[in-house]
């Protein structure tokens, strides 16, 4: 359960991959598309509003036997739109929604080496936002692999 309905803190940051490709958002046909691309030097990076929430997480709900206080995050690149996990399609999508946000909009934040982060689906433990074919996708990670796969590592730059 998420402790309280308001975030403990928020920050604006640009999101890039471990290999320094930018995550960008474009309005197309009244819906937003998410791209992973090399940005031209003079192009401004898109910013995302990260809202951080605390969550008590019993071990029975998680794929890795972890229990305790976790940090959850929602990601909003533009007003009223949030990144959401579509577990059926293994995709990451931008949806317009009102608060309270659905569980699909919450991701467990993992700090990683080299000051990278990973985003694990609240609704599907062991599944992370990752990069596949220049798009964001949901990627199942085997915990025995130490979660070191570069395709689920992201950098936050304020």
């Amino acid at each position: 359960s998420i402790t309280g309905i308001s975030p403990i803190t928020e920050s604006l940051a640009s999101l890039s991959t471990y290999n320094d490709q930018s995550i960008t958002f474009a309005l197309e046909d009244e819906s937003y598309e998410i791209y992973v691309e090399d940005l031209k030097k003079d192009k401004k990076k898109d910013k995302v509003l990260l809202s951080y929430y605390e969550s008590q997480h019993p071990s029975s709900e998680s794929g890795d036997g972890v229990d305790g206080k976790m940090l959850m995050v929602t990601l909003s690149p533009t007003k009223d739109f949030w990144l959401q996990a579509n577990n059926k399609e293994h995709s990451v999508e931008l949806h317009k929604c009102e608060k309270p946000l659905p569980d699909q909009a919450f991701f467990v934040l993992h700090n990683r080496s080299f000051n990278c982060v990973s985003f694990e689906c609240k609704t599907d433990p062991g599944v992370f936002i990752g990069v596949k074919d220049n798009h964001l996708a949901l990627i199942k990670v085997d915990y025995s692999e130490n979660l070191g796969s570069e395709n689920i590592l992201f950098k936050l730059s304020e």
């Epitope: 803190t9 972890v66 305790g68 993992h110 700090n111 130490n146």
Partner: antibody, heavy 122, light 107 residues
């Protein structure tokens, strides 16, 4: 309740090694990362590095790289910090501290061991 | 590395006083800043995390604010048990770094 209990004080000669233990109780040990922080007499706090109790991943501050090893034994819920090639300026109280979030270091340290005084003297 | 500079390094105050300690970062970051209290011969104790969130069990006279590169710890009405040394710590990125400490002494 959560407790981190550290091993007792040590006196070592320059060039020797010391291994400090930190036994955790009152929570699921492999859910939280452990950091090691030291404090020289009359000085401030200095972070040495971190280890994930979940998978053993670690990160050491550059100045300690090559001299420090942080390990965990999940069967006994114990974290260890070994410092080698001791010098007189390693004389300090060494603390283990639990990160307050299971998967993140953003929240600081919510529980600390009582500290272990390591004296390096010839 | 992010350097944390605390000021003042010491402050003399009386019971009931309002005390403010500041912490400045060498580069801006979000709100991942913690404050600790340490008494002689004891381990530090977490007071504030995420710049302004009060740790469970900590009295409400302690409060934190700030973001970017300037952060503040305020004790609204100093109590006898509050005479101690206070440290800030950035938890934003490795290496994690502490401020030099502020000693709050009895006037």
């Amino acid at each position: 309740q959560v407790q981190l209990v550290q091993s007792g004080a040590e006196v070592k000669k320059p060039g020797a090694s010391v291994k400090v233990s930190c036994k955790a109780s009152g929570y699921t040990f492999n859910s939280y990362g452990i950091s090691w922080v030291r404090q020289a007499p009359g000085q401030g706090l200095e972070w040495m590095g971190w280890i994930s109790s979940h998978n053993g991943n670690s990160h050491y501050v550059q100045k300690f790289q090559g001299r420090v090893s942080m390990t965990t034994d999940t069967s006994t819920s114990t974290a260890y910090m070994e410092l080698r090639s001791l010098r007189s300026d390693d004389t300090a109280v060494y603390y283990c501290a639990r990160h307050s979030y299971t998967t993140s270091w953003y929240g600081g340290f919510d529980y600390w061991g009582q500290g272990t005084l390591v004296t390096v003297s010839s | 590395d992010i350097q944390m500079t605390q000021s003042p390094s010491s402050v003399s105050a009386s019971v009931g006083d309002r005390v403010t300690i500041t912490c400045r970062a060498s580069q801006g970051f979000s709100s991942w800043l913690a404050w600790y209290q340490q008494k002689p011969g004891k381990a530090p104790q977490l007071l504030i995390y995420a710049a302004s969130s009060l740790q469970s069990g900590v009295p409400s006279r302690f409060s934190g604010s700030g973001s970017g590169s300037d952060f503040t710890l305020t004790i609204s009405s100093l109590q006898p048990e509050d005479f101690a040394t206070y440290y800030c710590q950035q938890a934003n990125s490795f290496p994690l770094t502490f401020g030099g400490g502020t000693k709050v002494e009895i006037k």
